[in-house]
């Protein structure tokens, strides 16, 4: 014979535990039914009733299977060095990211919550380490037989041309002028 | 308007039986997910939870009190009663009834009523 | 049964204070605390739920935080009205008030 199915709430047998998407509820000592993502528990169950789930009011949220009385509230709207990568709806809270240039300098659970302009490497000076979305860039002086003219977040230093003929030699913030020779 | 009013005998004599009722408007115990409590507060004292019921007859009880109580309902009437047997100088109180959602914290109370048990 | 302990018990403190109440439980319960205001001949008034949810028409004044098994109530600016007796409740597991926190003016 097939075992027979439980319908929440039901008490679960000594030492088991309840099932996927239920909880144990310890004032009815019951396994109760969870609400879904986007919804929150608005009457919590007894020993002869199940939960009774309500969607989630405007801006907030619920992402996992739950038995919360209240949703959670979205973050706070984007700012002005952000753009927002996921919008607040019932199931997810907003996310927001650095826009291009920007960097992620104090991060949140998801997303960032202070963003701050990449570093330009000034003439002289070349990227080591490109800038990512939580790490700033790391310049570096660029090393003889190369240069950076720029003042630039993303420009390594390169090298100086090759010349027959010096005309000026290159340093760190400019290149080697070459002499044209005429045939 | 919600609001909820205990009555009691005012007072007893030790081992003879408390019984208490709660008159309440402005809600209904037919309605998914209320519930009514009784909370009571000895004189000088703090204030302990005794029992609750639910829309759907579900009831609890504090345990270290539960041989001793008895929560009932006239759902018609919008009364709650709760009876406590072989009434002690110990059960010398103000008793307290407040409605309780359906997420389980009791948001409106009555006045409450002053229960004496003396010889 | 889980046990709320309070304090502290009585509080003194003048007019325009923050005053903050502490209520620890035994075991964890999962924010649901709710605070009240007890005022003599009267019942019970609601402040809080659910660790920090105020209830509608109750001053900001009041603000609740906490969470697991520590949690705590505070009253910014004291005003002569909040003279009262304050508890806590716990909702996680049946229902245990703390012990009562009795304000009063210096």
């Known amino acids: 014979l097939p075992a027979q199915v439980a319908f929440t709430p039901y008490a679960p047998e000594p030492g088991g535990t309840c099932r996927l998407r239920e909880y144990y509820d310890q004032t009815a000592q019951m396994c109760c039914s969870k609400c879904p993502p986007g919804q929150h528990a608005k009457v919590f169950c007894t020993k002869t009733s199940d939960t009774v789930c309500d969607s989630c009011e405007d801006s907030t949220y619920t992402q996992l299977w739950n038995w919360v009385p209240e949703c959670l509230s979205c973050g706070s709207r984007c700012s002005s060095d952000q753009v927002e990568t996921q919008a607040c709806t019932r199931e997810q809270n907003r996310i927001c990211t650095c826009r291009p240039g920007w960097y992620c300098a104090l991060s949140k659970q998801e997303g960032c919550r202070l963003c701050a302009q990449l570093r330009k490497c000034r003439p002289g000076f070349g990227v080591a380490r490109p800038g990512t979305e939580t790490s700033d860039v790391v310049c570096k002086p660029c090393a003889p037989g190369t240069f950076s003219n720029t003042t630039s977040s993303t420009d390594i230093c390169r090298p100086h041309q090759i010349c027959h003929v010096v005309a000026i030699p290159g340093n760190a913030s400019m290149d080697a002028v070459c002499t044209s020779t005429s045939p | 308007q919600v609001t909820l009013k205990e009555s009691g005998p005012g007072i007893l004599q030790p081992s003879q039986t408390l019984s208490l009722t709660c008159s309440f408007s402005?809600?209904?115990?037919?309605?998914?997910?209320?519930?009514v409590g009784w909370i009571r507060q000895p004189s000088g004292k703090g204030l302990e939870w005794l029992a609750h019921i639910w829309w759907d007859a579900d009831k609890y009880y504090n345990p270290a009190l539960k041989s001793r109580l008895t929560i009932s309902k006239d759902t018609s009437k919008n009364h709650v009663f709760l009876k406590i047997a072989n009434a002690d100088t110990a059960d010398t109180a103000t008793y307290y009834c407040a409605r309780m959602t359906g997420t389980r914290y009791f948001d409106v109370w009555g006045t409450g009523t002053t229960v004496t048990v003396s010889s | 049964d889980i046990q709320m302990t309070q304090s502290p018990s009585s509080l003194s403190a003048s007019l325009g204070d923050k005053v903050t109440i502490t209520c620890k439980a035994s075991q964890n319960i999962n924010k649901f605390i709710a605070w009240y205001q007890h005022k003599p001949g009267e019942g019970p008034r609601l402040l809080i739920h659910y660790t920090s949810t105020l209830q509608p028409g109750i001053p900001s004044r009041f603000s609740g935080s906490g969470s697991g098994s520590d949690y705590s109530f505070s009253i910014n600016n004291l005003e002569p009205e909040d003279i009262a007796s304050y508890y806590c409740?716990?909702?996680?597991?049946?229902?245990?008030f703390g012990g009562g926190t009795k304000l009063e003016i210096k």
């Open positions: 402005g809600f209904s115990l037919n309605t998914l997910g209320m519930g």
């Open positions: 409740l716990q909702y996680g597991v049946l229902w245990t």
